[in-house]
Every structure is written in C-alpha cells, then in structure tokens.
C-alpha cells in the first residue's frame, strides 16, 4: 500500500499510457525536508517493478539521471501489454537494518490504438423493437477504449450512444433504445462506430441500411388449424403476424419425419390452405415471416403447432392368411389371420374388423366383428368356402379383402421344389424354391409361412407369413426371427382353387446344442434294442437339430465307440439298433448335431442284451 505520496512524487514521461515497444522515463523526487535524517547524501532512491502485485525487477541499474539526495530518473523499456506498477522507495544506506521506505508509485499502461471497427450489423426485432448494432472491435487494445455508435437518418437527426471496453468488459454491441417505424420504410440510415483511447482513435466505414434491411419481424403467433368438414387431408392454417409482413414461409412435417414440407406464401394475411396432409397423423407446423419480397430477413420460426389430423376411412387391403384343421369326418376348424394396416392405410384408429365366411353357393354365411387380428370358426368340410375381412375406423370401413379357402397342402403337383433355407445374418433367413413341376393350374401367388418350433407354438402363436408374386422364387424372412431358434418354414403355392406346399426347417444363427438328448428307456424286442429319449429342451437346442447320434461301447472298453446317426424328426423319439452282442454290458449315450456342431453327450445308460443278436 502506497501512503498517498507524503515523501515525494513520481512522474512519467512522455505519459503514463504508452504504445507497445516504447520506452518511458520515470522520475522519483523527494519533497523538501524529506529523506534520511540530516544527511541528504545518504538518500538512495530505488525503483521497483511489480506485475500483478508481484515484484519482478529492481531497476537500480536503469538510472539515467541522478540528483544525489533528492531525485532520480529511470528508463524503463520492453514493457509488456497491460498495466505495470512502479514503486519508488527510499533506501537510507547508513542504516542497513531499516527496510526501504515507499515514497510514491505510478501505473504505466501499455497498449495499442484501436483498429477501425468492422462488420457492423444492425437489427431491430419486430416492428416495435429497438435498433441494436454489433461490430467487430479488432485487436484487444489493453486500454480503456470508448466506442461511440452514431446513427444518422432523415429529419437531420443523429442519435448516438457510448460504451467502453477494458480488462473487465467488452463493448461490441449497443442497443440504442430507439425504434425505427414503418413510416421510415423508404428512408436510408447511416451508422458508424468510432473507437477512442489514450493512444488514438479510429472510425468504421459508414454502413448504410433501410428499415427493411434491419427489421426482423417477430415470429408469427397464435397458430391454429381448421380442418374443412373434418377432413383429414385438407386444412386451413391460420396465424397472427405483424402488420407489414408480405411473405411467409410455412414448414410442416409428421412428427416422426426428418424432412420438412416447405411452402412460400405471398400476401397470405395470416391464412393458408394445405391440401396434401395425411389423415390421422401427428403434424408439427411452423411459420416464418418477411417484410419484403426480395430484401430483408426472415423472422425466427414460430413456436410449433402440434396437432393430429382427423381420421378418414381406411384404404388399402388387408393381408389375410388362414389355417385349416380337420376336426372329424364332417367338420373343420378355420383360423383366419390378418396383418394390421399400416398407419397411412388405416388413416385412423381401427375400432374393429368385419369378418365374413361364406359358402360359395351362398347357402351359408357367417359374419362377425372382432377387435383382434384373428378369428376362428368351425364349419362343415363340404362346400367351397371364401373369407373376407375389412377394417373399420370412426369414418368408415376399408374395401373387404377376399381369400378362397382351399386345402393348403392338398395338391402334390402344386408343391414347390428344392426348398432351401439359408441363414443370412442374425435376424433373417433366405428361403428359395423352384416352381411346381407339373401344376394343373397356374400359380397365382406363393405364401412363405414360418413358425418357431417350440412346444405349443401352433396353438399359442399366430403364424408369420409373406405373400410373394408368382414370378419370384425367394423370400427374405425377418419378422420375429431370433438367433438360435429353429423355425418351420412352409412355402405354399396357391392357384385359384388349389394349394400345394413344401416344408423345411431353418435358423438365422446356430450353435452346438447345450446338451444331448436324455435316454429314458432301452427295451429289447425281437432281437433288437429300442432306444427311447426325450428331446432336448427348446432353449438348449440353439438352432435346428439336423440329426441325433446314438453312441455305444462295451463297458470298461477303451476302444472308440460305435455310432448310429438318425435324421432328426420332431415326432420321433425312439430308434432301433441291432449290432450289439448278447450278454455283454454296453454303455449308451446320445448327442445332437446342428450346423454349428455336436452337443456334449447326454446321460449314459448301461444295458446288457439278453437275446440272440445278429
């Protein structure tokens, strides 16, 4: 802390503010009758340099002039940008014990003259906003620099406002607090910014603009939409705008979309008819405004209006499939299945489905409505039957979809050939086939149907299916396909009144099964052994099992076991073997094989055949 310079004074030449690279002379003078007791010759003045309150240098060697005892002048050079503090102290050389006493101090600021401000930009937000201008100040000056924004216009009137930059605040924007009104739409304004500090001044180039150049309209507000006659595709968008607006931009999109529909509307006066909306769809609408057709700026986008368009009656046709099961000699169960319409076809919330089963000669008609996507009925086995299904929402129903009920696998000549199923990746399977060789009638379409081969899947889960045109011989199935699960895949060929099918199993990814089958019994019949087993639990199969292997060897033998490989069939759970010696004790076990490899062995069973073996 400097004690208000009681002992003396410090002065700077040429000034306490100097340009970068300049030198300064600092003079320290003692006041009369101040100094070291009565020996002026013992007065020694020293100058200390501080940066950020830290002593960085003693300038003892920089003296350029010395009046022993009462004043000294020091030259300082290479000062860095910003503020540096210099403190003059009195050192009484004859008393070494006393520290130097502060005399006075001075701050020297090093900086640069301001550059001409550039890139002036002025805006007024809305017709009732005020003019605010911003600019680029250029290089930091390291000095307090005053900026004056001056706006000149008609009526011989000039407005101005000031702000300053220093090491604590930056001044590169000013709001004049003055509004430009539409009555000045044709007038030209000139704005310039002047910067001034202790080292110089500079002025920007004049920037000229009109009302229309700088006024950014407020975003439209109070946006609403009116659907004409509750139409789901036509609506009138309405909004409030500032009075001078001549051009609007509308953008709208379904909420789950990534691209906007854009419309330009001239002299819309807060109203615009939209004709291409999708019914029963959540939309987002936004509007922007402009005061001039060619010049000026667009407003920010308005707040979003989010609304759902009304429903319209469903369009499109349902994708129907069915299963047929004979119950007894004169009755069959028909299960109809259909896929939900996609939203663009449903055009509303589907309230129910209208299902009709009709005997072609019109003797019998069964009708019902259901909210589900399946329907099961028991009907006579006689007669030719047709089914139709339509979907209904609050506005109406779709056109019914018809399908002839035929014996899906009844005609061998219509069975597709060379059906194969290849895993493409984790979640799909490529099914290929060849057309039926000697079909009596033309194939109208193929249906690829698949179902997980798990217990109860026929009753618990509806099938999945794909309709394939008659000239295609492949299908990539992916719906509900999971890795490590085996699917039964059927390819149906349908003509107008007949059906043929071929079946195959397939998986999208496989591993070796977790365990082998569990042998439950070994029985001897007519000199043959019958091995019975339980299938591997469904989760442990890990894909389609291609075959089972039955292994056996004599107990305590170190020889390689013999084996018998059986083609996997789901319905089969026993198999005969006939190459075992009587009255020899054998150890038997089983494994299962997928395309990925063989399982660990299942349980071991010992057995000693009694009868005569081959």
């Amino acid at each position: 802390n400097i004690d208000v310079c009681k002992l003396g004074t410090v002065t700077v030449q040429p000034a306490p503010v100097i340009p970068l690279g300049s030198a300064a002379n600092i003079s320290c003078s003692l006041n009369p009758k101040q100094g070291c007791s009565h020996y002026p010759s013992s007065n020694e003045l020293i100058l200390l340099k501080f940066v950020n309150d830290v002593l960085v240098e003693n300038l003892h060697g920089k003296k350029v002039h010395d009046h022993t005892g009462h004043s000294s002048t020091f030259q300082v050079t290479n000062l860095s940008l910003g503020m540096t503090l210099f403190v003059c102290k009195l050192n009484c050389s004859n008393s070494q014990k006393k520290p130097p006493v502060p005399v006075c101090g001075v701050e020297i600021s090093v900086g640069v003259a301001p550059e001409p401000p550039q890139n002036i930009s002025c805006v007024q937000e809305g017709e009732n906003g005020t003019v605010a201008c911003s600019w680029n100040s250029g290089k930091v000056t390291y000095l307090k620099t005053n900026y004056t924004l001056q706006l000149s216009g008609p009526n011989n009137l000039t407005c101005q406002k000031q702000c300053f930059s220093d090491n604590r605040q930056n001044c590169n924007r000013l709001d004049l607090g003055i509004n430009l009104s539409p009555d000045l739409a044709e007038s030209r304004f000139i704005v310039r910014v002047t910067a001034i500090n202790d080292l110089g001044n500079s002025s920007s180039l004049p920037h000229t603009f009109t009302f229309l150049d700088i006024v950014i309209p407020l975003p439209p507000w109070d946006i609403r939409i009116n659907f004409l006659n509750a139409s789901g595709s036509r609506g009138t968008l309405q909004w409030e705008d500032e009075g001078q607006v001549v051009l609007n931009q509308l953008r709208y999109q379904p909420l789950n979309s990534t691209s906007w529909n854009m419309v330009n509307a001239t002299n819309a006066k807060g109203k615009y008819d939209l004709r291409d909306l999708r019914p029963f769809t959540e939309y987002e609408f936004q509007i922007s405004s402009k005061l001039h057709l060619s010049g000026g700026s667009w407003s920010n986008w308005s707040e979003s209006l989010r609304t759902r368009t009304p429903e319209e009656e469903p369009v499109g046709i349902l994708d129907i499939w069915y299963m047929k099961q004979d119950i007894d000699y004169d009755r069959q169960q028909i299960s109809l299945f259909w896929k939900s319409l996609n939203p663009s076809e449903a055009r509303g919330k589907i309230l129910h489905y209208q299902v009709t089963l009709q005997e072609v000669t019109k003797k019998t008609t069964l009708q019902n409505t259901t909210r589900h996507t399946s329907w099961t009925r028991v009907i006579p086995r006689t007669g030719a039957w047709t089914a139709s299904v339509s979907a209904a929402n609050s506005k109406g129903a779709s056109a019914p979809t018809h399908i002839n009920i035929v014996d899906l696998c009844g005609t061998g000549l219509l069975a597709p050939h060379q059906v194969s199923a290849k895993s493409e990746n984790m979640d799909n399977i490529l099914v290929t086939w060849q057309p039926p060789k000697k079909a009596d009638s033309a194939v109208r379409e193929y249906i690829v149907e698949w179902r997980a081969l798990q217990p109860g899947s026929i009753t618990k889960f509806p099938p999945h299916w794909l309709r394939i045109p008659p000239d295609n011989m492949s299908a990539l199935i992916s719906e509900n396909i999971k890795p490590y699960i085996c699917y039964e895949i059927r390819v149906h060929a349908l003509s107008e009144s007949q059906g043929g099918c071929s079946s195959i199993r397939g998986d999208s990814k496989h591993k070796a099964p977790v365990s082998g089958p569990h042998i439950t019994a070994i029985t001897e019949k007519k000199e043959r052994l019958f091995i019975s087993w339980t299938h591997i639990p469904f989760p442990e199969q890990r894909g389609c099992i291609l075959h089972y292997r039955i292994y056996w060897k004599e107990r305590d033998s170190t020889a390689q076991p013999e084996l018998c490989e059986i083609q996997y069939r789901r319905s089969q759970n026993s198999h005969p073997i006939s190459s075992l010696q009587p009255r020899v004790t054998y150890v038997l076990w089983m494994t299962a094989v997928t395309a990925a490899g063989e399982s660990p062995q299942g349980n071991e069973r010992e057995f000693c055949p009694q009868g005569k073996a081959n």
Epitope: K161, L176, G177, I178, L180, L184
Partner: nanobody, 125 residues
Framework: QVQLQESGGGLVQAGGSLRLSCAAS????????MGWFRQAPGKEREFVAA???????LYVDSVKGRFTISRDNAKNTVALQMNSLKPEDTAVYYC???????????????????WGQGTQVTVSS
C-alpha cells in the same frame, strides 16, 4: 406529474458557451426521455436535442458536435452544454419530458407531455 424549470440562459457573444439546466420535480423522472426544443422569433418551434432512458442522445444536425445533452437521474436534472454558439442559435429554449419511442417521434413536439416555461438565449455577433 412532472414540473420542469429551466435556468442558465443569457446573452453571450458568438463563439462563446452557455450551459442550460433543467430541474424536474416528480419521482418518475428516469422513466422519461428528456430534451430541448427552441423557438426563434417569427419561426416554428424546432427540436434541438434529447436523451432517452437508456442514455442514447439525439441531436439535430445544426447543433451536432457543438451541443452536448446529459442527464443526472439522481438529481432529476438534464443539462445542455452549448459551445461555439452562433447568432442563429438565438431563441427561447424549452426543457421537455415525454415518451417518444421511434426515431420519427423525437423531433415531434406532440410526443412530449411536459414543457418548461423556457429560457432566453441570445447570441450577439
């Protein structure tokens, strides 16, 4: 309600200076734009200078660079420092308070609700 009282007028030689002051009574002084109009004998009243609530100053081109308007909200005063005076600056100077908003409003006397009695400034050649 705001009352305005001007002072500082007088006779001065061309090239000289005068400082006009205007004292306002009323607590809402800082809400108003303050300004000065003048009226020379036989002429219409004309706008001279104004300062708005945010500190922006406005001048008619004929006085720009010679006159400076300032306000002190703490003291409820507004001042007009007039340098390099010319004989054509001779007029009665009125202190005004109002709420002009747009650039076009400031020179319009109808936009100012409160007026002082006026102080005479005479510049002799």
């Amino acid at each position: 309600q705001v009352q305005l009282q001007e002072s500082g007028g007088g006779l001065v030689q061309a090239g000289g200076s005068l400082r006009l002051s205007c004292a306002a009574s009323g607590r809402t002084f800082s809400n108003y734009a303050m300004g000065w109009f003048r009226q020379a004998p036989g002429k219409e009243r004309e706008f001279v200078a104004a300062i708005n609530r945010s500190g922006t100053t406005l001048y008619v081109d004929s006085v720009k660079g010679r006159f400076t308007i300032s306000r002190d909200n703490a003291k409820n005063t507004v001042a007009l420092q007039m340098n390099s005076l010319k004989p054509e600056d001779t007029a009665v100077y009125y202190c005004v308070a109002g709420m002009p908003f747009s650039y076009s409003d400031y020179p319009r006397d109808s936009k100012y609700d409160y007026w002082g009695q006026g102080t005479q400034v005479t510049v002799s050649s």
